[in-house]
Amino acid sequence: QGWQAFKNDATEIIPELGEYPEPPPELENNKTMNRAENGGRPPHHPFETKDVSEYSCRELHFTRYVTDGQCRSAKPVTELVCSGQCGPARLLPNAIGRGKWWRPSGPDFRCIPDRYRAQRVQLLCPGGAAPRARKVRLVASCKCKRLTRFHNQSELKDFGPEAARPQKGRKPRPRARGAKANQAELENAY
């Protein structure tokens, strides 16, 4: 239910050179009328390195139907999963089998959602019930972010398609976005 992936594309995000170690204060980012600059959210330049190609943050694309209770979207939506450790790119791809996982001795950079977007979804329900219109929150892009010991443990998980579809009537947990209803299938996709 929900995770019928038609397509699975991976895109590597190579961070641009930027300030270290945190993004600068984006004071009063003015999201102007009818202008979608950077999707309306400020860009992040999380860290600098002598060789930018050494870092990798992967965007995995999944196309699937979304569900809400017994109702299912009339059309599939394409979602992003942010994956990867933001470690040296040369060690990340296909490295699991060889056990070559890069572990930084310093700050832990993780590949997490940067910006979000909404997409309209029409849900078709069984039993002749009226269709429903909803807007789903989808990850628009991923970024490498430096995590500190102050970050919530939930942030250390890989971020799936919104990491979570909160179950009906249950409040989503901050940041982690609620119960990971399809997490097992998500992890298999990795």
């Epitope: 999201k31 102007t32 009328m33 009818n34 202008r35 979608a36 999707g39 309306g40 959210r41 400020p42 809400d68 959602p113 940067d114 910006r115 979000y116 977007r117 909404a118 997409q119 309209r120 029409q122 009226a130 269709p131 429903r132 219109a133 909803r134 807007k135 789903v136 929150r137 628009a140 919104e162 979570a164 579809r165 909160p166 409040k171 989503p172 901050p174 940041r175 976005r177 609620g178």
Partner: antibody, heavy 121, light 109 residues
Framework: EVQLVQSGAEVKKPGASVKVSCKVS????????MHWVRQAPGKGLEWMGG????????IYAQKFQGRVTMTEDTSTDTAYMELSSLRSEDTAVYYC??????????????WGQGTLVTVSS | QAVVTQEPSLTVSPGGTVTLTCGSS?????????PYWFQQKPGQAPRTLIS???DKHSWTPARFSGSLLGGKAALTLSGAQPEDEAEYYC?????????FGGGTKLTVL
């Protein structure tokens, strides 16, 4: 759970500007869709503008275009609403309101406590 | 800009049923207007009762329900309680633009 805390009451003279802040906790501001709504004394709710995540832009109500500016400081998770060329009819309680996070967008789920702006000469 | 209309005031007896409606100057209200309903009591910020036509929230009493009725959005209160006396606002989306209705003052008498 999202929580919104707004700045304190303001008294302004006609023609001046006011800037109201709204501090977000529980989520990061960049995850949420922030809107601003005002309510004049004894009147109804009036939408001023907000972030449309579908178009990735801030949209202002026609009535306020050119006079209102909504900005965000993502480093402090604080949203701002600045209204210029104030007149007496701008006297109102100004609310920030945001969605609840989560997979389905549910807008206007969490509201600030309101900021009373009084415009008087 | 579209105008969203609501009944200025309605009265319901305790335990009774009442339906508040929300119309659009542009024509029929559909699910694509994502109707929202809010309750506001004096001196308080509004709180959302219904999102997206019919979606209740964890804090929404079961006696409230949202629907589309006769080309309008509707909020039905079944089994009114004294604490339901309040101002009720609807909201419609027109693309990225949002318009509130003028509000309905509901009296439980």
């Amino acid at each position: 759970e999202v929580q919104l805390v707004q700045s304190g009451a303001e008294v302004k003279k006609p023609g001046a500007s006011v800037k109201v802040s709204c501090k977000v906790s529980g989520y990061t501001l960049s995850e949420l869709s922030m809107h601003w709504v005002r309510q004049a004394p004894g009147k109804g709710l009036e939408w001023m503008g907000g972030f449309d995540p579908e178009g990735g832009e801030t949209i202002y109500a026609q009535k306020f275009q050119g006079r209102v500016t909504m900005t965000e400081d993502t480093s402090t998770d604080t949203a701002y609403m600045e209204l210029s060329s104030l007149r007496s009819e701008d006297t109102a309680v100004y609310y920030c309101a945001t969605d609840a996070g989560g997979y389905w967008y549910k807008f206007f789920q969490h509201w600030g406590q309101g900021t009373l702006v009084t415009v008087s000469s | 800009q579209a105008v969203v209309t609501q009944e200025p005031s309605l009265t319901v007896s305790p335990g009774g049923t009442v339906t508040l409606t929300c119309g659009s100057s542009t024509g029929t209200v559909t699910i694509d207007h994502y109707p929202y309903w809010f309750q506001q009591k004096p001196g308080q910020a509004p709180r959302t009762l219904i999102s997206d036509t019919d979606d209740k929230h964890s804090w929404t009493p079961a006696r409230f329900s949202g629907s589309l009725l006769g080309g309008k959005a509707a909020l039905t209160l079944s089994g009114a309680q004294p604490e339901d006396e309040a101002e009720y606002y609807c909201l419609l989306f027109y693309g990225g633009t949002v318009v509130f209705g003028g509000g309905t003052k509901l009296t439980v008498l």
